[in-house]
Interface confidence: medium
C-alpha cells in the first residue's frame, strides 16, 4: 500500500473523520490539504486499496493571484446506503512530484439492528411430517441470537445450542405460522412470517379389490391429515401404452387421464367405462380444506378379458346334397378380448345337437348323414375369447342349394368324413 514519505511535511490539514451507523445510512468523509502550485488529484483508499469507482467530489480554492501560489483542496467521499462492504479504514492519497502522501485514517463502522440474510419461507408439508426452516441474521454488533416463534409463541431453545439457524419441526397437525427474531445489543429485528400449510399425507396401499372387463374397483388407505378431515379423494386412470411403463415418480403421462372423485369414507371407488383386456395405470390423491396430498405412484392394473358382446354376423348356411356350406363374419360388437375362435352348433328336427369348434376360420363344410334327409336343419355360431363364449347367433335354417345359386366366393374347407352327430359336447 502507498506510504507517505517523511522527506517533506504532509500537505494534509484535515483528515477523514469516523462514521458509525446502521445499514442504509448515508455519510460523507472529508479531507483537506494545502499545496503550492497546481493542485493534485486526491485519491481515496479503503484498507490501503485505491477506490477506483469512488463517489467523490474535489473542490479547489486558490489562496493567491498566481498559479504558483497555495491552493486549498477539499475532497469529499460520499457513502450512500451503508453496507458491511463499506466498512474499513479510509485515507486520502496524493502524488506531489515524486512523493506520495497519505492522510491520517478515518474509520467507517456498521452497527445497528440485526440484518436478515435468510428468512423462513412459506411452504406446504404433509401432516405429521418433519421439516426444517432456516433463518440467518448478522450484526454488527455481534453476537446475534435467534429466537423462533410458532403462531406468535416463542419456542424455547435448548441452552448452549446458541442461535438456531435451522429449526427442525418434527411435524404439524395444523397450518401454522413461523417467524424468527434476531437479537443483538442494539435491539431486536423480526423476520417475515412464513405460513406452513398442512396437507394430507399421501395415501398408501392403493390396490385392486375386484376386476371386471369394463370396470375396476380400487381401494386405498388414507394418510393422516391433521385436524382437517378429508373432503374427498381423486383417482386418475390413464391408458398405458405398450411399453410406456409409467415409472414411480416419473412425470405425468402424455394422455389425458380419466379422473373420478370419491366421497370419503369409504376409501374405495368403482371405475367404470373402461376398455376390456386393457392395461391402465392408476393413482390417487386425497384433499382436505387445506389442499390436496401428493399423488401416489402410478400403479399398473389391467382389466380382464370379457366374452364377445355380440354374435357373428351375416351367417349363411346352404345345403347341396349331403353337404352343407356355412360361413359368417366376425361380430361387429366388441370382442372384449382376443378372439380365439368360433363354435358352431347344428341340429335337425329329430336329431341331437352337434357342437363343433371351428377355430379362427369363418367357414365350414359339413358332411350330412346318409341321403341328406335331415329335415329342418338349423345352424348357430358363437365367437369366443379366453373368458368364454359370446352370445349365440339366432338359428339359421339350412337352405337347399338351387342350380344357378352362387356358391360362396371364398374357399370352403371340407371337414373330414366322420359319422354324423359324433361331435363331443363342449
Amino acid at each position: 500500500a502507498p506510504r507517505g514519505t517523511q522527506a517533506e511535511e504532509s500537505p494534509f490539514v484535515g483528515n477523514p473523520g469516523n462514521i458509525t451507523g446502521a445499514r442504509g445510512l448515508t455519510g460523507t468523509l472529508r479531507c483537506q490539504l494545502q499545496v503550492q502550485g497546481e493542485p493534485p488529484e486526491v485519491h481515496w483508499l479503503r484498507d490501503g486499496q485505491i477506490l477506483e469507482l469512488a463517489d467523490s467530489t474535489q473542490t479547489q480554492v486558490p489562496l493567491g493571484e498566481d498559479e504558483q501560489d497555495d491552493w486549498i483542496v477539499v475532497s469529499q467521499l460520499r457513502i450512500t446506503s451503508l453496507q458491511l462492504s463499506d466498512t474499513g479504514q479510509y485515507q486520502c492519497l496524493v502524488f506531489l512530484g515524486h512523493q506520495t502522501f497519505v492522510s491520517q485514517p478515518g474509520y467507517v463502522g456498521l452497527e445497528g439492528l440485526p440484518y436478515f440474510l435468510e428468512e423462513p419461507e412459506d411452504r406446504t408439508v404433509a401432516a405429521n411430517t418433519p421439516f426444517n426452516l432456516s433463518c440467518q441474521a448478522q450484526g454488527p454488533p455481534e453476537p446475534v441470537d435467534l429466537l423462533w416463534l410458532q403462531d406468535a409463541v416463542p419456542l424455547a431453545t435448548a441452552p448452549g445450542h446458541g442461535p438456531q439457524r435451522s429449526l427442525h419441526v418434527p411435524g404439524l397437525n395444523k397450518t401454522s405460522s413461523f417467524s424468527c427474531e434476531a437479537h443483538n445489543a442494539k435491539g431486536v429485528t423480526t423476520s417475515r412470517t412464513a405460513t406452513i400449510t398442512v396437507l394430507p399425507q399421501q395415501p398408501r396401499n392403493l390396490h385392486l379389490v375386484s376386476r371386471q372387463p369394463t370396470e375396476l374397483e380400487v381401494a386405498w388407505t388414507p394418510g393422516l391429515s391433521g385436524i382437517y378431515p378429508l373432503t374427498h379423494c381423486t383417482l386418475q386412470a390413464v391408458l398405458s401404452d405398450d411399453g410406456m411403463g409409467i415409472q414411480a415418480g416419473e412425470p405425468d403421462p402424455p394422455e389425458e387421464p380419466l379422473t373420478s372423485q370419491a366421497s370419503v369414507p369409504p376409501h374405495q371407488l368403482r371405475l367404470g367405462s373402461l376398455h376390456p383386456h386393457t392395461p391402465y395405470h392408476i393413482r390417487v390423491a386425497c384433499t382436505s380444506s387445506q389442499g390436496p396430498s401428493s399423488w401416489t405412484h402410478w400403479l399398473p392394473v389391467e382389466t380382464p378379458e370379457g366374452v364377445p358382446l355380440g354374435p357373428p354376423e351375416n351367417i349363411s348356411a346352404t345345403r347341396n346334397g349331403s353337404q352343407a356350406f356355412v360361413h359368417w363374419q366376425e361380430p361387429r360388437a366388441p370382442l372384449q378380448g382376443t378372439l380365439l375362435g368360433y363354435r358352431l352348433a347344428y341340429q335337425g328336427q329329430d336329431t341331437p345337437e352337434v357342437l363343433m369348434d371351428i377355430g379362427l376360420r369363418q367357414e365350414v363344410t359339413l358332411e350330412l348323414q346318409g341321403d341328406g334327409s335331415v329335415s329342418n336343419l338349423t345352424v348357430c355360431v358363437a365367437a369366443y375369447t379366453a373368458a368364454g363364449d359370446g352370445p349365440w347367433s339366432l338359428p339359421v335354417p339350412l337352405e337347399a342349394w338351387r342350380p344357378g345359386q352362387a356358391q360362396p366366393v371364398h374357399q370352403l374347407v371340407k371337414e373330414p368324413s366322420t359319422p354324423a352327430f359324433s361331435w363331443p359336447w363342449w
Partner: nanobody, 118 residues
C-alpha cells in the same frame, strides 16, 4: 403503548424459591404472548418461559419441572414461580410481551436481578 414492570427478584439460597411478577399497563388488550428472558453475565439472552392467551406454555429445557409461568388476566400480571433454584439461574430476568396483529410489536421490562448462592 405497553409498559412492563418486573418485581420479585433478589437473593436466594440454592434449592430455594422466588416468585417474579410482571405487571402490564397501557394498551394491554393488544398483548397476545408474554414471557420471561434472562441474561447471565457474559452470556446471550435466553428465553426462560412464555405463555400465550390460550393454554400454550413453553419452557427452556434447563428450567422444565422447576419453573412455572402463570397469568392473572384480571390483574394484568404474569408470574414466574422459580423452585429448586440453582446457582446457574443467577441472571437479570426480563419480562417481554408480543403484541397481536404484528409480531414485531415488542415490549420489554427493565429487568430484575436474581442471585442464587450456593
Amino acid at each position: 403503548q405497553v409498559k412492563l414492570e418486573e418485581s420479585g427478584g433478589g437473593l436466594a439460597q440454592a434449592g430455594g424459591s422466588l416468585r417474579l411478577s410482571c405487571a402490564a399497563s397501557g394498551s394491554i388488550s393488544s398483548i397476545n404472548t408474554i414471557g420471561w428472558f434472562r441474561q447471565a453475565p457474559g452470556k446471550q439472552r435466553e428465553l426462560v418461559a412464555a405463555s400465550d392467551s390460550g393454554a400454550n406454555r413453553n419452557y427452556a429445557d434447563s428450567v422444565k419441572g422447576r419453573f412455572t409461568i402463570s397469568r392473572d388476566n384480571a390483574k394484568n400480571t404474569v408470574y414466574l414461580q422459580m423452585n429448586n433454584l440453582k446457582p446457574e439461574d443467577t441472571a437479570i430476568y426480563y419480562c417481554r410481551a408480543w403484541g397481536t396483529g404484528t409480531i414485531s410489536t415488542m415490549y420489554w421490562g427493565q429487568g430484575t436481578q436474581v442471585t442464587v448462592s450456593s
